[in-house]
């Protein structure tokens, strides 16, 4: 691999680092406009295609929707193939994603709505272990606007263990967000959507390259955390957000100083939700092990605003509302590393449902 990248923009400077977090408490349970969908049918199957997303959007007065589940603001219309076989996809045309990649019509897709009362407490889910996430300013990291999200490419050496013998290395992180007045997390909790969500994507050490792992159970693992508003600025996130202006145009890429990636995640790595799903964008490959932290990461209102207004996507449209609608569980159980269900008994339930990556 060639060394010594010189980006298209100026050389940024380094900020300081810290993280603020909060628990998913009663303050994040569904508000009126974020009502959860009706209960699943008796056979345990979820309703097809979409959950309450269409009702939620309608109640918020967002009228320019091209599909039931996704706003059109962010990516313009889908699928105006420009010749040359581009794999065009957009958040305004998610019903067409299976045409881009058949896996997007799979039965075990992400994101999902995490219904606390339906989670299964699983004592075998141990605290995650992160190693080497506290990066030094040098070497610098590539920060890019790929038209769908802001992406930070991570260097080799960031190791994560889901459990004994389940080791992964971090590849990249990216964010999902809404607008100034509409939240944009991908996962939801009891139907509640958070302002934004971070994903840190990992490749199993059992595979040397990404293409080998795509679609294989446990081949990829994603750590996800919700971003929530608080009065104080998050200095760790400021090291990313302060550079968004420099990559405002689609296709922009710059180099920024290395930072403490663990500071972008909650401090409590022991309380989380776990399920097997997919990539949330095409090709929507399944077999992805999802870990969604219970603790939220706090950003200031100004920082969340900066995230939602700084980037531009295709056809001179703002890069906003870049989240996929929640997908049916289709019989999947979401496990929790702690008793998340409000009425959970002292004894763990569904212990036998616990799975390990690769099972």
């Amino acid at each position: 691999q060639p060394q010594g990248l010189s980006g298209m923009q100026g050389e940024p400077s380094l900020g300081d680092s810290s993280s603020g977090e909060d628990e998913l408490g009663v303050d994040v349970l569904p508000s009126e406009e974020d009502a959860p969908e009706e209960a699943d049918p008796p056979d345990g199957e979820d309703p097809p295609e979409v959950n309450s997303e269409d009702r939620m959007e309608e109640s918020l007065g967002l009228e320019d929707l091209s599909t039931p589940e996704a706003p059109e603001h962010s990516q313009g219309s889908h699928g105006d193939e420009k010749g040359g076989g581009h794999s065009h996809w957009s958040y305004g045309g998610t019903l067409l994603w299976p045409q881009v990649s058949p896996a997007c019509a799979g039965r075990f897709q992400s994101p999902v709505d995490i219904r606390l009362e339906r989670t299964a407490f699983c004592r075998t889910l141990q605290p995650l272990e992160l190693l080497g996430y506290e990066l030094q300013p040098l070497p610098e990291l590539s920060l890019s606007n790929n038209g769908h999200t802001v992406q930070l490419t991570l260097p080799p050496g960031l190791k994560m263990a889901l459990g004994p013998g389940q080791e992964y290395r971090a590849l990249q992180l990216h964010l999902h967000w809404g607008t100034s007045d509409h939240p944009g997390s991908e996962h939801t909790v009891n139907g509640h959507r958070f302002p934004a969500e971070i994903h840190v994507v990992h490749l199993s050490t059992a595979f040397s390259e990404l293409h080998e792992a795509l679609g294989r159970p446990g081949g990829l693992a994603v750590l996800a955390a919700f971003l929530q508003e608080s009065p104080e600025e998050n200095s760790a996130y400021e090291q990313l957000l302060s550079h968004l202006e420099e990559i405002s145009e689609e296709g922009s890429k710059i180099e920024i100083p290395g930072l403490d990636v663990s500071a972008l995640l909650p401090s409590d790595l022991s309380r989380y939700y776990r399920y097997e799903g997919s990539l949330t964008t095409p090709p929507c490959s399944q077999g992805v092990i999802w870990t969604v932290f219970n603790e939220t990461v706090k950003l200031s209102a100004k920082q969340l605003h900066t995230l939602s207004v700084s980037l531009w996507g295709p056809r001179d449209s703002r890069l906003q509302l870049n989240f996929r609608a929640t997908q049916p569980l289709n019989g999947r159980t979401i496990e929790a590393s702690f008793p998340a269900a409000e009425d959970s008994s002292p004894e763990p339930v569904h212990v036998n449902s616990c799975f390990t990556a690769g099972d």
Epitope: G147, E209, G215, P283
Partner: nanobody
Framework: EVQLLESGGGLVQPGGSLRLSCAAS???????????MSWYRQAPGKGLELVAV???????KYSDSVKGRFTISRDNSKNTLYLQMNSLRAEDTAVYYC????????WGQGTQVTVSS
């Protein structure tokens, strides 16, 4: 194994043109359709410079030094990335590398472009 193979480099006079190609092969899943594709270059004794990017939507971005002279394009049906280079200058002399960025970076081995009279 996934491979990116550049071709089309060579010796050209100032003001001339070249078309570089980058063919992706070996991947069991066509991840390159979902990758942002880029051309980088490295001149002798210099660092790596990002020349042009094309996203999955076809959006393009160029470095100031090549804007208006170079054109990046892609053909996902052929798993191929292109760089049309016109009005070449001596300072465009470099090894040109192809890059695919989808969750992880894939790099080619590079092709030499020499602009000299």
């Amino acid at each position: 194994e996934v491979q990116l193979l550049e071709s089309g480099g060579g010796l050209v006079q100032p003001g001339g043109s070249l078309r570089l190609s980058c063919a992706a092969s070996g991947n069991s899943v066509n991840i390159f359709s979902f990758a942002a594709m880029s051309w980088y270059r490295q001149a002798p004794g210099k660092g790596l410079e990002l020349v042009a990017v094309i996203t999955t939507t076809g959006g393009t971005k160029y470095s100031d030094s090549v804007k208006g002279r170079f054109t990046i394009s892609r053909d996902n049906s052929k798993n191929t990335l292109y760089l049309q280079m016109n009005s070449l200058r001596a300072e465009d002399t470099a090894v040109y590398y192809c890059n695919a960025d989808y969750l992880q970076d894939y790099w080619g081995q590079g092709t030499q472009v020499t602009v000299s009279s």
